[in-house]
């Protein structure tokens, strides 16, 4: 139940490009530590939850109208890029930096 | 069911400071259009969903491991400030700009 669910936080997740079916065009790396955010954004939102002012307001509105307004959601607040070596459509080898691939921190939004 | 739920988008929400119990310290405004984000971040994430690269990856991992990794969540991508006139602890009247109070746009994160 949501009462027992842990508070919003970063969880470790390694993503294999083979599992995603991308192994034929991504040369390197074979995968990466993507991580993800999960957990409850429940009242009261404490400092660890990196909550925006809007999230604080939304939490209060949710308490008064849970059927209509959801709790804020647990989402990335800091994301990092990774460099990927891949084949383009013309079979050229390209090194490209992909933004917003790795979750560094999570918060209530 | 999640299949029937609309895609991630901005929903209108007017918040009354009286409803929040803040009427004794907030002089003006009486309330504001806070809005909120809600809806599904389901595969495939289209351009309207303002999805990060991480959200695209997480959507695929969720489909393969729904028990372990949640769908990305629908969260604000653009927030605006509002100016608030209020009494401080010493009963002084203060005009202050509060950041991240109004949802302007939503996306999958």
């Amino acid at each position: 139940s949501s009462e027992l669910k842990t508070a919003c936080k970063k969880h470790e997740l390694y993503v294999s490009f083979q599992d995603l079916g991308w192994q034929d065009w991504i040369i390197a790396p074979k995968g990466y530590a993507a991580n993800y955010c999960d957990g409850e954004c429940s009242f009261p939102l404490n400092a660890h939850m990196n909550a925006t002012n809007h999230a604080i307001v939304q939490t209060l509105v949710h308490l008064m109208n849970p059927e209509y307004v959801p709790k804020p959601c647990c989402a990335p607040t800091k994301l990092n890029a990774i460099s990927v070596l891949y084949f383009d459509d013309n079979s050229n080898v390209i090194l490209k930096k992909y933004r917003n691939m790795v979750v560094r921190a999570c918060g209530c939004h | 069911s999640s299949e029937l739920k609309t895609a991630c988008k901005k929903h209108e929400l007017y918040v009354s400071f009286q409803d929040l119990g803040w009427q004794d310290w907030i002089i003006a405004p009486k309330g504001y259009a806070a809005n909120y984000c809600d809806g599904e971040c389901s595969f495939p994430l289209n351009a309207h969903m303002n999805a990060t690269n991480h959200a695209i990856v997480q959507t695929l991992v969720h489909l393969m491991n729904p028990e372990y990794v949640p769908k990305p969540c629908c969260a604000p991508t653009k927030l605006n400030a509002i100016s608030v006139l209020y009494f401080d602890d010493n009963s002084n009247v203060i005009l202050k700009k509060y950041r991240n109070m109004v949802v302007r746009a939503c996306g999958c994160h």
Epitope: G21 | L63, E67
Partner: antibody
Framework: QVQLVQSGAEVKKPGSSVKVSCKAS????????MHWVRQAPGQGLEWMGY????????KYNENFKGRVTITADESTSTAYMELSSLRSEDTAVYYC???????????WGQGTLVTVSS | DIQMTQSPSSLSASVGDRVTITCRSS??????LAWYQQKPGKAPKLLIY???NLADGVPSRFSGSGSGTDFTLTISSLQPEDFATYYC?????????FGGGTKVEIK
Amino acid sequence: QVQLVQSGAEVKKPGSSVKVSCKASGYTFTSYAMHWVRQAPGQGLEWMGYINPYNDGTKYNENFKGRVTITADESTSTAYMELSSLRSEDTAVYYCARRPFGNAMDIWGQGTLVTVSS
Amino acid sequence: DIQMTQSPSSLSASVGDRVTITCRSSENIYRNLAWYQQKPGKAPKLLIYAATNLADGVPSRFSGSGSGTDFTLTISSLQPEDFATYYCQGIWGTPLTFGGGTKVEIK
């Protein structure tokens, strides 16, 4: 060794409920999702739903229209599947099955026969 | 919901035969398919996961191939203990759906 042991066979009246248990041993219960699958006599396999005992996250097959509830008790490493408003078509063998991340249902319980008859 | 269609629904074969069972998904599920074997009165047993990966303890005569919407389970040389019913399962969101099954009988 890793195993799932289910409760014994049940005979139930139409309209009543049944609760089947599945006791896990030989692994960390909260590290793996537990699924429930049923099989009517002479028929194929039908997925009912799952629970992740780590966070009590559940998901159900909508074919059961809110009649199924899956729970887990970490203290006894036991998962439960309760099916309410039973009808004769619910007569089936009910299986619990573990599914690791990135894998399929690798360990299954022995099955529990539930017979619904007036 | 994704539909999984297995064919044939039944087949007769002899010991030593090469047997092929196919499974088609109504949507692209990439490599997210499993195969199970079930004998009468027993629980299903995992044979193949992620379309091609052999589960622990499964003999090498079993192999899986395919990706996207079309998948195949092959038994290279049928053994007496292989007479059973085989199910495919798509693992792509929920509900997790099974194929209708293929019964492999002795000719």
